[in-house]
């Protein structure tokens, strides 16, 4: 199908195809195109979709920060995903940040957890 | 012969809210992502949010985010600006166009949105 | 966001003349998502090219487009006298859609 058809202001330009909306939605690693004729690919490594959709521009991919390392690469269809550097961690309350780990436990208190990309060492009480 | 025709500028005080309306005729509505794009007096022009042809997906430029919601009606054919907490740097002639990414090949012929005191 | 940036700011041509006005984008932008308008004082916009090339309906061939990447180039062979306006290039290749600044062609 050429854009003539479809618009009688713009003439065909090339364009990925990939497949027909199915019910007015792409599937995942697409986006729907303006007149809603067409499913178009996102860019691997640059953008993402990750479920069915009417979006008219894929997700753009997360890039890890310094101190972060790429666990896993931003697909068409799925998300970079970044985890903090070893000896750092993110807590929840503030997940924009890799906060460095207690190197150890103060004194009374014993190491129970070493530190991951999750959580920041974890000590107890020594019993007497 | 496609037309979009735009409607609800005025003069508001800031802080104030206005609606506007862009109706569509003489293309299918509901299959077309639309926009709204502005121009402040003298200025260039500035897009200002967009929606998909099913309304399931919209998007703001950071400017208006959190303030003004597009949204479309597809069984009237027509396409609408909710303004809120208006500013001053919100004047502007405000355009409904068709499209978004591959060019806005049809345009309303705008409406003036005074934001004042 | 991608930034596009025109020149030169104002082109002073004769009717006759041949102009050309430059969109240099911050970040590659595809072809397929470039697009020119032309503007007169008190009117919409109007899209003269899209897909960085492609004439929309009802342009004169006087008006091409051309380039890729991060430099595109709309080209007027002759300037007819209501070909002075303001010219836009615009983009969508990533959200925000965004316009260059406009370059202003009038009458030297």
């Known amino acids: 199908i050429t854009r003539q058809s479809l618009d009688p202001q713009r003439r065909a330009a090339p364009q990925q195809k990939r497949s027909s909306p199915t019910e007015g939605l792409c599937p995942p690693g697409h986006h729907i195109s303006e007149d809603s004729r067409e499913c178009i690919s996102c860019k691997y490594g640059q953008d993402y979709s990750t479920h069915w959709n009417d979006f008219l521009f894929c997700l753009r991919c997360t890039k890890c920060d310094s101190g972060e390392v790429e666990v896993n690469s931003c697909t068409t269809t799925r998300n970079t995903v970044c985890q903090c550097e070893e000896g750092t961690f993110r807590e929840e309350d503030s997940p924009e940040i890799c906060r460095k780990c207690r190197t150890g436990c103060p004194r009374g208190m014993v190491k129970v957890k070493d530190c991951t990309p999750w959580s920041d060492i974890e000590c107890v009480h020594k019993e007497s | 012969e496609v037309q979009l025709l735009e409607s609800g500028g005025g003069l508001v005080q800031p802080g104030g809210s206005l609606r506007l309306s862009c109706a569509a005729s003489g293309f299918t509505f509901s299959s077309y992502a639309m926009s709204w794009v502005r121009q402040a007096p003298g200025k260039g022009l500035e897009w200002v949010s967009a929606?998909?042809?099913?309304?399931?997906?919209?998007y703001y430029a950071d400017s208006v985010k959190g303030r003004f919601t597009i949204s479309r009606d597809n069984s009237k054919n027509t396409l609408y600006l909710q303004m809120n907490s208006l500013r001053a740097e919100d004047t502007a002639v405000y355009y409904c166009?068709?499209?978004?990414?591959?060019?806005?090949?049809?345009w309303g012929q705008g409406t003036l949105v005074t934001v004042s005191s | 966001e991608i930034v596009l940036t025109q020149s030169p700011g104002t082109l002073s041509l004769s009717p006759g003349e041949r102009a050309t006005l430059s969109c240099r984008a911050s970040q590659s932008v595809s072809s397929s998502y470039l697009a020119w308008y032309q503007q007169k004082p008190g009117q919409a916009p109007r899209l003269l090219i899209y897909?960085?090339?492609s004439r929309a309906t009802g342009i004169p061939d006087r008006f091409s487009g051309s380039g890729s990447g991060t430099d595109f180039t709309l080209t007027i062979s002759r300037l007819e006298p209501e070909d002075f306006a303001v010219y836009y290039c615009q983009q969508g290749e990533s959200p925000p859609p965004t316009f260059g600044q406009g370059t202003k062609v009038e009458i030297k």
């Open positions: 929606i998909s042809g099913s309304g399931g997906s919209t």
């Open positions: 897909g960085a090339s």
């Open positions: 166009a068709k499209g978004v990414r591959k060019g806005f090949d049809y």
